[in-house]
Interface confidence: low
């Protein structure tokens, strides 16, 4: 059975957190990606961006977990206006920025 | 209110043993990850040790491992510190805190008591 | 283990802005917490998750976090904000809490 969205959130939460505190080198080789407008449409707006990274193996339980909350297929390539225009920032940031922004949200009760 | 009080300190002699107490009130004590934190006289902060919300795990300063054990009641509302074979350098103040648990251990400590005194000397 | 690397002191005018420094390796990559320390009292919590701020803490109060370096910045400075300053940040390779050595913000 589905878990439920808070136990989703808190499980990719908590994969967000295993990846900051774990880093002993630059995420993904210190790839850039294309930063997101926290705002609305989190979720596939994340996974949009990061599924550009392909072969980093450190964030692929991310994107998995991301998919998981994303209710259209995302393909790489693709990008809403979501995206903050001509603004990349390395992977580290961008997964430490989403895993202050969920934190929030989980704060709040927002789990869908 | 929300609260933390901490009792036990006292002075004792070199390689003595001390426990000190951690009581709390104002809040949901078992959902809380709880931490130990010393400051000897006129300097910094320095952690000492951690106990899971639900007792499963306890991680210590490299410092005190071996010597100190953390435990908590959750029916009590109590937090313990058992120090065995005190040194001179483990006078200070100690405080005890709480740290969100579902965070696991990256949270910050949002609540700490006004800490008690230990003093080791012969 | 990981080490966190304040400058002993920090003095500004009332007024004035107080930049504080946390240094780390990849500091940028964790999640770093601010404490203020009062002479007698025990530590209070005033910038967590690297820029947030408790509700009761003032707006002036303020941080960031990237590279190696995480700053508190305090601006308009009053003479109450006169105190001891910690950073913390929990560090997985050990499993241990570690904190910064301390800063002390004097308001001349």
């Known amino acids: 059975s589905p878990v439920p969205p808070s136990t989703a959130l808190k499980e990719l939460i908590e994969e967000l957190v295993n990846i900051t505190q774990n880093q002993k080198a630059p995420l993904c080789n210190g790839s850039m990606v294309w930063s997101i407008n926290l705002t609305a449409g989190v979720y596939c707006a994340a996974l949009e961006s990061l599924i550009n990274v392909s072969g980093c193996s450190a964030i692929e339980k991310t994107q998995r977990m991301l998919n998981g909350f994303c209710p259209h297929k995302v393909s790489a390539g693709q990008f809403s206006s979501l995206r903050v225009r001509d603004t990349k920032i390395e992977v580290a940031q961008f997964v430490k920025d989403l895993l202050v922004h969920l934190k929030k949200l989980f704060r709040e009760g927002q789990f869908n | 209110q929300m609260q933390l009080v901490e009792s036990g300190g006292g002075v004792v002699q070199p390689g003595r043993s001390l426990r000190l107490s951690c009581a709390a009130s104002?809040?949901?004590?078992?959902?809380?990850?709880m931490h130990w934190v010393r400051q000897a006289p006129g300097k910094g902060l320095e952690w000492v040790a951690v106990?899971?919300?639900?007792?499963?795990?306890?991680h210590y300063a490299d410092s005190v491992k071996g010597r100190f054990t953390i435990t908590r009641d959750n029916s009590k509302n109590t937090l313990n510190l058992q120090m065995n074979s005190l040194r001179a350098e483990d006078t200070a103040v100690y405080y005890c805190a709480r740290a969100p648990q579902w965070m696991l251990v990256a949270e910050a400590f949002d609540l700490w008591g006004q800490g008690t005194m230990v003093t080791v000397s012969s | 283990s990981y080490v966190l690397t304040q400058p002993p002191s920090v003095s500004v005018a009332p007024g004035q802005t107080a930049r504080i420094t946390c240094g780390g390796n990849l500091i940028g990559s964790k999640l770093v917490h601010w404490y203020q320390q009062k002479p007698g009292q025990a530590p209070v919590l005033v910038v967590y998750?690297?820029?947030d701020r408790p509700s009761r803490i003032p707006e002036r109060f303020s941080g960031s976090n990237s590279g190696n370096t995480a700053t508190l910045t305090i601006s308009r400075v009053e003479a109450g904000d006169e105190a001891d300053y910690y950073c913390?940040?929990?560090?997985?390779?050990?499993?241990?809490?570690?904190f910064g050595g301390g800063t002390k913000l004097t308001v001349l």
């Open positions: 913390q940040v929990w560090d997985s390779s050990s499993d241990h809490v570690v």
């Open positions: 998750d690297d820029s």
């Open positions: 106990i899971w919300y639900d007792g499963s795990n306890k």
């Open positions: 104002g809040f949901t004590f078992r959902t809380y990850g």
